[in-house]
């Protein structure tokens, strides 16, 4: 005996007034032919003919899930009693965007919760949000197919000056966060060491304030602040940066001992541990992973290892004593 067995017993469903045996029979005992599954769906217990009272289960193809009541029941009149059921996509398809925009990461399908970043060539910014997240079967916020790149006002204003500055006659002066930043500029996630807090700021405002000698402001990453590894690393990197001997300006960012400024993207990219040069007197005594032994590493090695999200405990600054 199995509780799951179905011998076509007449049942009363919650929303039915009559038992199936009480329904008028049109063609007795003929059963039902195979029903048509919804688009992107299939019948799990597939066969040519089904008995009266028998259920079929609707399943969905990989990348889709059932929405609604997924069982059809064979009625005595040879038809199927079926509720509204459909197979909805559980992944997002790579959006179709204008050729000028670059999608990162570039995949065919994205799982729920995965995000993409849209970027433009140097000197241009996305004319709208740059970060989108796959939710259900669509992107949030919705991606407009007219979305394009626009000339970066920061680039226009700055002339031959550095980011955050503008041309005033023959000299460069800091932009005013209030007066010069009314236009749209891409969002950045920024950390303020004074308030020990991070927040989303328009790029123009961040650069203008940084130019006005706001040394407590640190760039974390492009896009609005969102919990996750990128934010986590941004904060840890800021803490490590105070001991860095190298501070190289790079786009919105400043690169430190364990990083290289990518010429093509104007972003700081972590080196890999073997790329670290031995020089430097910024040493740390650390414990790696689950190892009990101590090791002396330089700041570059510490930065690259933490950037790679490898487990490491900093015991103290300076050489290990043993």
């Amino acid at each position: 005996f199995s509780i799951m067995e179905n011998n076509g017993q007449p049942c009363i469903n919650d929303d039915e007034e009559m038992k199936e045996v009480d329904l008028p029979e049109i063609e007795a005992d003929s059963g039902c032919p195979q029903p048509v599954p919804p688009e992107n769906g299939f019948i799990r217990n597939e066969k040519q003919l089904y008995l009266v009272g028998e259920d079929v289960e609707i399943s969905c193809l990989t990348g889709f899930e059932t929405v609604g009541y997924q069982y059809f029941r064979c009625l005595p009149d040879g038809t199927w009693r079926q509720g509204d059921v459909e197979c909805q996509r559980t992944e997002c398809i790579k959006p179709v965007v204008q050729e000028v925009l670059t999608i990162t990461p570039f995949q065919r399908l994205y799982r729920i919760g995965e995000s993409i970043e849209l970027t433009c060539p140097k000197g241009f910014v996305v004319a709208g949000p740059s970060r989108y997240t796959c939710q259900g079967n669509s992107w949030t916020p919705p991606i407009s197919n007219s979305l394009t790149c626009e000339k970066d006002t920061l680039t226009k204003l700055k002339g031959h000056c550095q980011l955050g500055q503008k041309q005033s006659g023959s000299e460069c002066i800091c932009m005013s966060p209030e007066e010069d930043c009314s236009h749209h500029s891409e969002d950045l996630c920024v950390f303020d060491t004074d308030s020990n807090d991070y927040f989303t700021s328009p790029a123009c405002k961040f650069l203008a304030e940084k130019c006005l000698n706001n040394q407590q402001l640190h760039f974390l990453h492009i896009g609005s602040c969102q919990d996750g590894r990128q934010l986590e690393w941004g904060l840890e990197r800021t803490r490590l940066s105070s001991n860095s001997t190298k501070k190289e300006s790079c786009g919105y960012d400043t690169c430190y001992d364990w990083e290289k400024c990518s010429a093509s993207t104007s972003k700081c990219v972590c080196l890999l541990p073997p790329q670290c040069f031995k020089g430097g007197n910024q040493l740390y005594c650390v414990k790696m992973g689950s190892s009990t032994s101590e090791k002396t590493l330089n700041i570059c090695e510490v930065g690259t290892i933490r950037c790679a999200n490898r487990k490491m405990e900093i015991l103290h600054p300076g050489k290990c004593l043993a």
Epitope: T104, P105, S262, S264, L272, P273, P274, F277, K278
Partner: antibody
Framework: EVQLVESGGGLVQPGGSLRLSCVAS????????MAWVRQAPGKGLEWVAT????????YYRESVKGRFTISRDNAKNTLYLQMDSLRAEDTAVYYC???????????WGQGTLVTVSS | DIVLTQTPLSLSATPGQSVSISCRSS???????????LYWYLQRPGQSPQLLIY???DLGSGVPDRFSGSGSGTDFTLKISRVEAEDVGVYYC?????????FGAGTNLEIK
């Protein structure tokens, strides 16, 4: 100018041993991690092992772990690869490589051929 | 291990022509802090490999700007805008986003 010169390759029987050397010049050898990369005849490239500045940390590809040992002598500006229990599939040209801030394998030696055959 | 699949395995070009080589990874090379460690090397006949492109699109020191790299996630491309006779050899992509570091099987470029 960075120069890396490998030596020590040759013909060896399966199960045999060989020790490769790589003499470095044109830079401060002890300031850099070093690596060995190999290339089987007519095949692609394969990372073999990496060593840190003073030899206190070493890293190997799975297939050579326990058989190969990477080491260095900073006083002699020399990198070594001790290869034991050699197999036919270890037959390759072995390159010694140095990293830079651009890449893990930015500078390469000319390579030394190791043939494992009976 | 990450598998890098290069296409085509060989190609022939005339001087001045543009060519592209594709490198597809079995897994995304974008790490969780937004870095992608993808490199391109050229191995000329009888020589050691030489770095062309690092971090997907940055040009190696002394490499002519006829070479360019692009891509993200799992799909990467090396483009040579005006092929020259000296570009002959085998082109390899390499990833260092995941241990162990792995190389593609190579693409052999011949000049007609």
């Amino acid at each position: 100018e960075v120069q890396l010169v490998e030596s020590g390759g040759g013909l060896v029987q399966p199960g045999g041993s060989l020790r490769l050397s790589c003499v470095a010049s044109g830079f401060t050898f002890s300031d850099y991690y070093m690596a060995w990369v190999r290339q089987a005849p007519g095949k692609g490239l394969e990372w073999v092992a990496t060593i840190n500045y003073d030899g206190s940390s070493t890293y190997y590809r799975e297939s050579v772990k326990g058989r190969f040992t990477i080491s260095r002598d900073n006083a002699k500006n020399t990198l070594y690869l001790q290869m034991d229990s050699l197999r036919a599939e270890d037959t390759a040209v072995y390159y010694c490589a140095r990293p830079s801030t651009e890449a893990l394998f930015a500078y390469w030696g000319q390579g030394t051929l190791v043939t494992v055959s009976s | 291990d990450i598998v890098l699949t290069q296409t085509p395995l060989s190609l022939s070009a005339t001087p001045g022509q543009s060519v592209s080589i594709s490198c597809r990874s079995s897994q995304s090379l974008l790490n969780d802090v937004g870095n992608t460690y993808l490199y391109w090397y050229l191995q000329r006949p009888g020589q050691s490999p030489q770095l062309l492109i690092y971090l997907v699109s940055d040009l190696g020191s002394g490499v002519p700007d006829r070479f360019s790299g692009s891509g993200s996630g799992t799909d990467f491309t090396l483009k040579i805008s005006r092929v020259e006779a000296e570009d002959v050899g085998v082109y390899y992509c390499m990833q260092a986003s995941h241990a162990p570091y792995t190389f593609g099987a190579g693409t052999n470029l011949e000049i007609k």
